[in-house]
């Protein structure tokens, strides 16, 4: 059977039930390279607390649809002998990155993952050419992702002191200059991730190889290489290298640009200092808001939600969206979809698509940009679920008792976009990080 | 106050059944995962069996088809189901509570030997 997912399988991925203190590592091709789940071992569960390690999904027992991985095994999940198999379900949905697969429960027979992945989609138009795994739990499980960072299309620009040079990078995903050919990307190669510029001249200076590493708590590291053996002529004989090193910082902070801190014979070493490498934890909530020890902040935006049926109301040209934050309350336009945010066309106001729905909530504060994001809303031709992105600003004048209103911004592929200057953004520090 | 205390224990014949009893006081029983242990005279306290929060259960290999771990929210207790006793079965037996939000708590023991 061909594997399913082949984007997927050059590398043995992590998920996490912090719960009950129990790493899972997942090889959704082959078998995880574990001894004491066993050769076949295609989910292997290590629980940290008994120090034992449990093989819950056996590769030679695999059965896959489109959306759908299960590994079953010959381990009887309970006592009484029944036909009952531990197994474990992956269930796939469409993504802009090769994501993460996330652990969701287990009960007594069956451990459950989700998992948002280019790999899952029904059309190309997120695939790189090359990606690797964007995210590393530390000692204490507790997750770093730098998913956020990846562009999708152009680059982030490396602050150097050379003014002949321009070195561009992506996170974990080479640069697409096609879909934002800026004039400096055009002529970077397909598939690297380093592109130096030069002139009117650009090179390869580092593809992603392997995927993130933790090297302490606060210090994430990617590695880049160029593939080929070809020299570049100003390298002195060696193959260039890019590594860059992600700083979780010792408090909140706005977020910086990487900088160049070394270069020698094209072995490029970059810092960046963000809180995108700090544990999710410190950055985001499943709730409105974001306090306590943990998150050295105070951020609620529970006051926004909506009442008694009313929505915000924001005006995108060929459709309005509707939206209620922060609350369970049906838009009353969008049909019992669970929607936070609803898109309905103007010129026919029976199309209506959940753009986003309230259960499927996330809070995040990082690099000094509050956003709230609302995802899994109806399908798109891609197969990717209607997302909105709402950027919150601090604006203690805001209209409407201080609530501000949210403003349709634009659209990318479909992620919809919103600014809200409210009062309610305005953010209080604490500093015990 | 946090506690847990464990009964059942006991003398009983080789082959023979047990079933302990760990009953929870002072947390949100349902969040934690509960686990057992045993300590032989003279031995390193050794795992024995898991109930997680979320109901997954894993057992060591030597008692694998002999105990069953379960629980009771209602009544804030787990219990450990002990058939096919053998000897070597002879030990404390603690239960232990764990979750992200509390250290791990232990209870005090109950005794637990085969004999004929």
């Known amino acids: 059977q061909a594997a399913p997912f082949p984007e997927l399988c050059s590398y043995t991925w992590e998920a996490v039930d912090t719960k009950n203190n129990v790493l899972y590592k997942i090889n959704i091709c082959g078998s995880v390279d574990i001894v004491q789940c066993g050769p076949s071992s295609a989910v292997c569960m290590h629980d940290l607390k008994t120090r034992t390690y449990h093989s819950v999904g056996d590769s030679v027992l695999r059965s896959a649809t489109r959306s759908l991985l299960e590994f079953n095994t010959t381990v009887s999940c309970d006592q009484q002998g029944t036909n009952h198999r531990v197994q474990s379900s992956i269930a796939f949905l469409c993504g802009k990155t090769l994501g993460t697969p996330e652990f969701v429960t287990a009960t007594e027979c069956v451990h459950y993952f989700e998992w948002r992945t280019t790999a899952a989609c029904k059309k190309d138009i997120f695939k790189a050419n090359k990606e690797v795994p964007c995210y590393v739990f530390d000692e204490e499980l507790r997750k770093h992702d730098l998913n956020p960072l990846i562009k999708l299309s152009g680059a982030y620009l490396v602050d150097d002191s050379d003014p002949d040079t321009s070195l561009f990078i992506n996170v974990c995903r080479d640069i697409d200059t096609l879909r934002d050919p800026g004039s400096q990307l055009r002529a970077c190669p397909p598939g690297t991730a380093a592109c130096l510029v030069r002139g009117h001249q650009a090179f390869d200076v580092g593809q992603p190889r392997d995927g993130l590493k933790v090297v302490r708590k606060d210090r994430l590291v990617l590695s880049y290489v160029r593939e080929e053996a070809g020299k570049l002529d100003f390298c002195d004989g060696h193959s260039p290298a890019v590594t860059i090193t992600f700083v979780c910082p010792s408090e909140r902070r706005e977020g910086t640009i990487p900088k160049l801190t070394a270069k020698s014979n094209c072995r490029y070493e970059i810092e960046w200092i963000t809180e995108y490498a700090c544990h999710r934890d410190y950055l985001e909530s499943k709730t409105c808001s974001l306090s306590g020890e943990q998150q050295d902040v105070s951020i609620d935006l529970t006051p926004l939600a909506q009442s008694g049926g009313s929505s915000y109301i924001s005006d995108g040209k060929e459709y309005l969206f509707y939206l209620n934050v922060c609350g369970e309350t049906e838009i009353q336009f969008c049909n019992k979809k669970q929607a936070a945010v609803c898109q309905v066309k103007k010129s026919d106001t029976s199309q209506v698509k959940a753009a986003g729905r309230y259960h499927n909530q996330t809070l995040r504060y990082s690099d000094g940009f509050l956003t709230l994001i609302y995802f899994g809303g109806d399908e798109c031709s891609s197969g990717f679920q209607r997302m909105s992105v709402i950027n919150f600003e601090c604006n203690k004048t805001a209209g409407n008792d201080g609530k501000g209103t949210p403003v349709f911004t634009g659209e990318v592929d479909c992620t919809y976009f919103f600014t809200w200057d409210t009062e309610y953004a305005c953010v209080h520090h604490h500093h015990h990080h | 106050q946090v506690q847990l205390q464990e009964s059942g224990g006991g003398l009983v014949q080789p082959g023979g059944s047990l079933r302990l009893s760990c009953a929870a006081s002072?947390?949100?029983?349902?969040?934690?995962?509960m686990d057992w242990y045993r300590q032989a005279p003279g031995k390193q306290r050794e795992w024995v069996a898991t109930?997680?929060?979320?109901?997954?259960?894993t057992y060591a290999d030597s008692v694998k088809g002999r105990f069953t771990i379960s629980r009771d929210n209602t009544k804030n207790t787990v219990y450990l189901r002990m058939n096919s006793l053998k000897p070597e079965d002879t030990a404390v037996y603690y239960c232990?509570?764990?979750?992200?939000?509390?250290?791990?708590?232990w209870g005090q023991g109950t005794q637990v030997t085969v004999s004929s």
């Open positions: 232990k509570a764990s979750s992200p939000v509390l250290n791990d708590i």
């Open positions: 002072g947390i949100i029983f349902s969040d934690n995962r």
């Open positions: 109930l997680a929060s979320y109901g997954w259960k």
